[in-house]
């Protein structure tokens, strides 16, 4: 019989008392085969973290800073359940740490040196740890003691709870630095008042502070937020302009064998019976013998943290950077304006080899990081392990939802000023063998399908989006008799036609021979009835252009396109017979790396781009003999995006809407995780 007990860790007598009450009340409402609570008492949160790691306890609720400690080796804990605040309809699980300034003050984030600062309190998250952690490497040396470095960075501050004797500049704007509401500039509202009164130039608070203190929009419009990219935004655009997004209070568990499903089952049932306004005799979010015992008193309920989300992703790149800076205190020697090497993310073995050759030829400007799937690469870019990669539009969508930005677009047509003119896009098509003359768009049910990969534009999002509109369900593996759609569940009929061996079968990378445009076309040639690819795929792999044995004798005339009106046309008539226009592949990165990725890639394409004529004797960035490694092989250049510099603007309203509709059918664990952070 599986042990269905969750050992909850308590950190005080009062918490232990509430835990016992929680245990007893749960017993009274949950059947004997359901989850139960046991209580473990420890002296501190850090002791609880160690106990969970050592399998002496299973769960505890922590503030963000402690979630970071819990994640660090050797603890390796992960977030499993989040408390939410506000309403069930609009649950808030995060708050945003922001830098608020007056509208007419005219400086940016990188110009804070010498300004006057208002903090909620020394050592507090939004008011101190996050802003000072992010500014850490700009502080004058020596950076220890930290208070002295901060005092020398700003021209004056109010940092309540600081030592006014040792660091008088930190108390210059609020004499005495009182650590309670007796100090008018203490806490969130106090730090904002410090800015409002004109004592300080910038206030480090949370996003809701300005709304709680200024009910009138006209008053709020006198203030702006400083963004990390050295721009400013209105105060209501905090989701796009903040220092960090911080989880409020989170239940953590072991990463391996952590009982996360059981913990969720327990807490979900607990909130049903003892949540807000549910029961008189025991309340989960109330602490008669103290404050915030086991859970925050202000919480309204729990949400399950998506399984794909580890602590790094949950806490976010900015928060992790800030806390790591403060804890480790390491900075690059003498920060320069020069760009660090760009860490390119390569998919599996083949891309890694090409990336390595690029790295050698770039003489250190490019470094390589490997991952097994595109989603793993996106996650690595999010958390700073990698910086950039080029993505199909479907993954530009996921990357955008995860906070990444497009920086350059692949262009596929030769033109005089290629780098200045991003193209409208390419065509997504459905290809069939000419010999299968009865096959049309209207009778694909029961046929064998070939897809570039799940989540990609021409191979999945466009054809499956159109299909979804027709069949109104997501069971595409029942619609087609079998197929190869790399990235599908291994036991799905949409992996049956794939050719990868062993663990590589149906993997969304080049270890699966039917992956990508060329792979999907090969699948059609060898096994399938229809392939969903781009309009250039057939000409690029016929007429001897692809020397591989399976392709060298193929003839373009032996293939036709399926049109949406039920007719068929020759391959060259793609402009009048396609499924939709697809946005070109684009390079994505984090916002903080945007300028450097742009600069280095433009240098790299001038050295190794289409201007290189002999690719047998020289490194060519856009060539890999039909394998589309790192970039599509038909890329002519990487083009500037001009104002299309967000994923929505880049992909266009129509495509974003189409992919949004298909979200109901999404199997993307990363998309689920990212929409948890930003619904």
């Amino acid at each position: 019989v599986p042990d269905k007990t969750v050992r909850w860790c308590a950190v005080s007598e009062h918490e232990a008392t509430k835990c016992q009450s929680f245990r007893d009340h749960m017993k009274s409402v949950i059947p004997s085969d359901g989850p139960s609570v046991a209580c473990v008492k420890k002296a501190s949160y850090l002791d609880c973290i160690r106990a969970i790691a050592a399998n002496e306890a299973d769960a505890v609720t922590l503030d963000a800073g402690l979630v970071y400690d819990a994640y660090l080796a050797p603890n390796n804990l992960k977030p499993v359940v989040a408390e939410f605040y506000g309403s069930k309809e609009d649950p808030q699980t995060f708050y945003y740490a922001v830098a608020v300034v007056k509208k007419d003050s005219g400086f940016q984030m990188n110009q804070l040196r010498g300004k006057k600062s208002c903090h909620t309190g020394l050592g507090r998250s939004a008011g101190w740890n996050i802003p000072i952690g992010l500014l850490y490497c700009d502080l004058p040396e020596p950076r220890k003691p930290l208070e002295k470095a901060v005092a020398n960075f700003f021209s004056g501050s109010c940092a309540p709870c600081a030592d006014g004797t040792d660091f008088p500049q930190l108390c210059q704007l609020c004499p005495g630095c009182g650590c309670s509401t007796l100090n008018q500039y203490f806490g969130y509202s106090g730090a904002f008042k410090c800015l409002k009164d004109g004592a300080g130039d910038v206030a480090f608070v949370k996003h809701s502070t300005i709304f709680e203190n200024l009910a009138n929009k006209a008053d709020r419009d006198q203030y702006e937020l400083l963004c990390l990219d050295n721009t400013r935004k209105p105060v209501d655009e905090y989701k796009d302009c903040h220092l960090a997004q911080v989880p409020s209070h989170t239940v953590v568990a072991r990463s391996m064998g952590g009982k996360e499903d059981l913990i969720w089952e327990l807490l979900n049932q607990a909130q049903e019976h003892f949540g807000k306004d549910k029961s008189k005799e025991f309340q989960l979010f109330s602490s008669p013998h103290g404050k915030d015992l086991l859970f925050k008193d202000s919480a309204h309920g729990f949400l399950k943290v998506p399984p794909r989300m580890d602590a790094k992703m949950y806490l976010g790149y900015e928060y992790v950077t800030a806390i790591r800076n403060l804890r480790e205190g390491t900075c690059p020697e003498a920060p320069t304006d020069e760009c660090k090497p760009v860490k390119w993310c390569a998919l599996s073995h083949h891309e890694r080899l090409k990336c390595d050759e690029w790295s050698v030829n770039s003489v250190g400007k490019i470094e390589c990081v490997s991952a097994e799937t595109t989603e793993d690469c996106i996650a690595k870019i999010m958390n700073g392990e990698a910086d950039a990669m080029s993505l199909d539009g479907g993954f530009v969508y996921i990357a955008g939802k995860c906070g990444l930005v497009p920086v350059l677009a692949e262009n596929y047509n030769k033109s005089d000023n290629c780098e200045d003119t991003p193209e409208a896009g390419y065509f997504a098509i459905a290809v069939v063998k000419k010999s299968a003359s009865d096959l049309t768009w209207d009778n694909l049910k029961g046929k064998k399908s070939c897809h570039t990969a799940v989540g990609r534009t021409a191979g999945w999002n466009i054809p499956m989006g159109l299909l979804y509109n027709k069949i109104n369900h997501c069971r595409f593996d029942e619609f087609f008799s079998e197929g190869c759609a790399p990235g599908s569940k291994k036991d799905s009929s949409l992996c049956k036609l794939c050719m990868g061996s062993g663990l590589n079968l149906c993997e969304p990378n080049n270890k699966e021979g039917y992956y990508g445009y060329t792979g999907a076309f090969r699948c059609l040639v060898e096994k399938g009835d229809v392939a969903f690819v781009k309009h250039q795929t057939v000409p690029q792999n016929t007429g001897g252009k692809n020397p591989d044995p399976w392709a060298k004798n193929l003839n373009e005339k032996d293939y036709e396109l399926l049109c949406l009106d039920g007719t068929r046309k020759p391959v060259e008539e793609y402009a009048n017979c396609h499924l939709a226009r697809a946005p070109n592949h684009a390079v994505v990165t984090r916002k903080d790396k945007e300028a450097c990725v742009h600069k280095i890639l433009r240098q790299q394409q001038h050295l190794f781009g289409s201007n290189v004529t002999d690719c047998s004797g020289n490194f060519c960035l856009f060539r890999s003999e039909t394998k589309d490694l790192l970039f599509r092989d038909d890329t002519v250049c990487l083009a500037k995006l001009h104002d299309r510099n967000t994923y929505e603007k880049y992909l266009g309203e129509e495509y974003v809407k189409a992919v949004g509709n298909l979200r109901k059918c999404s199997t993307s664990s990363l998309l689920e995780a990212c929409t948890f952070r930003r619904p």
Epitope: H349, H350, E357, F619, S624, K627, L629
Partner: nanobody, 117 residues
Framework: EVQLVESGGGLVQPGGSLRLSCAAS????????MAWYRQAPGKGLELVAG???????NYRDSVKGRFTISRDNSKNTMYLQMNSLRAEDTAVYYC???????????WGQGTLVTVSS
């Protein structure tokens, strides 16, 4: 296709030196980039050092200042001079020429380097 054969490995004490050679059966002059990789027991393949046709070199951080890659086009050979060897340099070392453009899964026998006292 160019065939490559690695040699020069062996057992060496920490702090010692070895020189690996990679002999090509065809002309390597036309090959754009060559590189040394290594694979430690139970680990993945990792790039150690690379050299372009013009002689520009690049090294992984952990070997910078200790290893030197070079090529002699007239002898169709590439070298890896390894000094101040450490236990963590223990691995099978392979050379590659990138001429088959990345997607080949063929690697030669490699040459084993063991650093141990």
């Amino acid at each position: 296709e160019v065939q490559l054969v690695e040699s020069g490995g062996g057992l060496v004490q920490p702090g010692g030196s070895l020189r690996l050679s990679c002999a090509a059966s065809g002309s390597i002059f036309s090959i754009a980039t060559m590189a040394w990789y290594r694979q430690a027991p139970g680990k993945g393949l990792e790039l150690v050092a690379g050299i372009t046709r013009s002689g520009s070199t690049n090294y992984r951080d952990s070997v910078k200042g200790r290893f030197t890659i070079s090529r002699d086009n007239s002898k169709n050979t590439m070298y890896l001079q390894m000094n101040s060897l450490r236990a963590e340099d223990t691995a099978v070392y392979y050379c590659t020429d990138y001429s088959s453009r990345y997607y080949h899964d063929y690697w030669g026998q490699g040459t084993l380097v063991t650093v141990s006292s």
